[in-house]
């Protein structure tokens, strides 16, 4: 999947299986990513588990779990708030669109989470105070998570190089992270579809093009669009909302 | 299987984890790689049958050869960060104010700095 980190790095990661997205004193978010096509290096999020840890007089431990075709509007125990404690309403789930869009407000840690199902896969977005981001007490797991550190070098896909190959008239098959590139989706069509939803040619737009060329699945256009929309709502610095690719001085550095 | 902790410590030691080292950083990068290798070796008993372990081992081998790191040499120390107090060590309160981050934050300082993370698509 594409990852925008807390430090505004933008990466395309092939991380497969279960990976920690956030892991701090208050919150643990784990994603499971699966290949979008058989044999493909490109992966998308098929499962998401969020654990809100027990916190003072505010909330009991609550677990939220979403999977493909199952986006619940409640925690795993069926509740919609933080439990029986005095400040239980400082954690709340709101269903925005049934089966498609859920928002979780954790006021006790100043955090808002948006989970969506777009097509077959899930998207995740969070707004969190820096103090909470860095509240990692256990040194063993310090910096464990993708949202903070990004994904490791050997797990990144350089989609700028991929794009350069895609733009050339006869692209070699090796340019694709997937051995099964749908030939029915020419570069120009992908560009046009992404331009419709994402008029600014930023990294969300580039991600959209990459996804369409890799999978041929137009739902990924919406995934990029909603990721940007969620960014608009959740990013505190509106000037930093659109990310643009940097000049590629370093191998593996995307954005 | 704690292989993800090894991964995390390596990313932490190599800063943002998002770029290759500059030439003058290579000794430190190699030291971090050797630490990573040691960490993965320690997880072998509990992770050896799992993909994440083998990915890490192969990734280390690739990076070692890419950056001409020797197998022997110094290792790096994990970075130590000063941390805000954990939730349970804060003063308990029956007042719901403690359950409203912004309200309790404003008492001590200016508005908090917010950050954003997102994951989508493929």
């Amino acid at each position: 999947p594409h990852l925008r980190t807390f430090t505004d790095h933008f990466q395309t990661c092939k991380v497969q299986g279960a990976w920690p997205l956030i892991d701090n004193n208050y919150l643990n978010v784990q994603v499971t990513n699966t290949p979008v096509l058989p044999g493909s290096a490109a992966t998308a999020t098929s499962k998401l588990t969020i654990i809100f840890k027990n916190f003072q007089e505010c909330v009991d431990q609550k677990v939220y779990q979403a999977e493909m075709d199952e986006l619940p509007s409640a925690f795993a125990d069926g509740s919609k708030n933080g439990g029986d404690k005095h400040g239980a309403n400082s954690l709340k789930i709101t269903e925005k669109v049934s089966g498609q869009h859920v928002e979780i407000q954790a006021k006790y840690i100043g955090t808002t989470i948006v989970v969506r199902q777009v097509g077959r896969y899930l998207t995740f977005a969070v707004r969190m105070p820096e103090e909470v981001v860095n509240a990692v007490e256990d040194r063993d797991s310090q910096g464990l998570y993708l949202c903070l550190r990004g994904c490791p070098l050997n797990q990144q896909i350089d989609f700028q190089a991929f794009r350069a190959n895609a733009e050339s008239p006869r692209r070699p098959a090796a340019a694709s992270p997937s051995p099964v590139v749908p030939e029915t989706f020419p570069y120009e069509t992908a560009v046009a579809k992404c331009k419709e939803k994402l008029p600014v040619e930023d990294l969300y737009y580039q991600a959209c093009v990459f996804d369409l060329l890799t999978t041929g699945d137009v739902n990924f256009t919406l995934a990029a669009y909603y990721a940007l929309e969620d960014g608009k709502m959740l990013h505190s610095n509106k000037d930093k909302l659109h990310l643009f690719e940097r000049t590629r001085e370093l191998p593996g550095a995307v954005a | 299987c704690k292989i993800l902790k090894c991964n995390s410590e390596f990313w932490s030691a190599t800063s943002s984890g998002s770029h290759a080292p500059a030439s003058d950083d290579v000794p430190e990068f190699c030291a971090a790689l050797r630490t990573y290798a040691l960490c993965t070796r320690r997880t072998a008993r509990t992770c050896r049958g799992d993909l994440a372990y083998h990915s890490a081992v192969h990734g280390i081998e690739d990076l070692m050869s890419q950056h001409n790191c020797s197998k022997d040499g110094p290792t790096s120390q994990p970075r130590v960060r000063t941390l805000p107090p954990a939730g349970d060590s804060q003063e308990r309160s029956d007042s719901p104010e403690i359950c409203h981050y912004e309200k309790s934050f404003h008492k001590h300082s200016a508005a908090p700095n917010y950050t954003h993370c997102g994951l989508f698509g493929d």
């Epitope: 497969q16 299986g17 279960a18 499971t32 699966t34 | 299987c1 040691l38 070796r41 320690r42 008993r45 509990t46 992770c47 050896r48 049958g49 799992d50 993909l51 994440a52 372990y53 083998h54």
Partner: antibody
Framework: EVQLVESGGGLVQPGGSLRLSCAAS????????MNWIRQAPGKGLEWIGM????????HYADSVKGRFTISRDNSKNTLYLQMNSLRAEDTAVYYC????????WGQGTMVTVSS | DVVLTQSPLSLPVTLGQPASISCRSS???????????LEWFQQRPGQSPRLLIY???NRFSGVPDRFSGSGSGTDFTLKISRVEAEDVGVYYC?????????FGQGTKLEIK
């Protein structure tokens, strides 16, 4: 939610063969080593063997070496245990378990070896 | 093979009281790197085993904090601070340090 469902157990005569299956769901099966463990009636747990995520290595307990074979089909999210030359002492509930070190277990399937 | 010996084999406990199970290994379970790979499993009547503790003292996800593990070298202990009715069952220690991996013979916890 991690789910492991064993099947294929039953009554078999000494010297006979049986193949057990373990259907996995709720996690990325192809990422994990898998184990078989058994429990004779009223007795403790005995590890039988394990297989790596990609089938590249298999390890067995001495008591079953040469008679039992573990395999897997990652495209079907299924783990197998082929049991040959069965003996009365192989009578047990057979469990499959996820991970190089088992964290989640199935509910088990009963194998009875008797004439 | 490494032999794990548990004691007692049967442990009657009053509800709300603490319980302690010992596991002794025939050789040290500490690796040359200083890690110790000893786990504890719980098997309730009629159910499959469930992981409680890994690497001597780490609680597995969802395990109540009344369970704790301790020990080093060859001597290990599983403690339950206040026994509840749902804790009835057999408890096994399990070592992963040496091949082949081995289980203890089990300790049956029952309510007095």
């Amino acid at each position: 939610e991690v789910q492991l469902v064993e099947s294929g157990g039953g009554l078999v005569q000494p010297g006979g063969s049986l193949r057990l299956s373990c259907a996995a769901s709720g996690f990325t099966f192809s990422n994990y080593g898998m184990n078989w463990i058994r429990q004779a009636p009223g007795k403790g747990l005995e590890w039988i063997g394990m297989i790596y995520y990609d089938s590249s290595e298999k390890h067995y307990a001495d008591s079953v070496k040469g008679r039992f074979t573990i395999s897997r089909d990652n495209s079907k999210n299924t783990l197998y245990l082929q049991m040959n030359s069965l003996r009365a002492e192989d009578t047990a509930v057979y469990y499959c378990a996820k991970g190089t070190t088992p964290d989640y277990w199935g509910q088990g399937t009963m194998v009875t070896v008797s004439s | 093979d490494v032999v794990l010996t548990q004691s007692p084999l049967s442990l009657p406990v009053t509800l709300g009281q603490p319980a302690s199970i010992s596991c002794r290994s025939s050789q040290s379970l500490e690796t040359s790197d200083g890690d110790t790979f000893l786990e504890w499993f719980q098997q309730r009547p009629g159910q499959s085993p469930r992981l409680l503790i890994y690497e001597v003292s780490n609680r597995f996800s969802g395990v109540p904090d009344r369970f704790s593990g301790s020990g080093s070298g060859t001597d290990f202990t599983l403690k339950i601070s206040r026994v509840e009715a749902e804790d009835v069952g057999v408890y096994y220690c399990f070592q992963v340090t040496h091949d082949p991996v081995t289980f203890g013979q089990g300790t049956k916890l029952e309510i007095k």
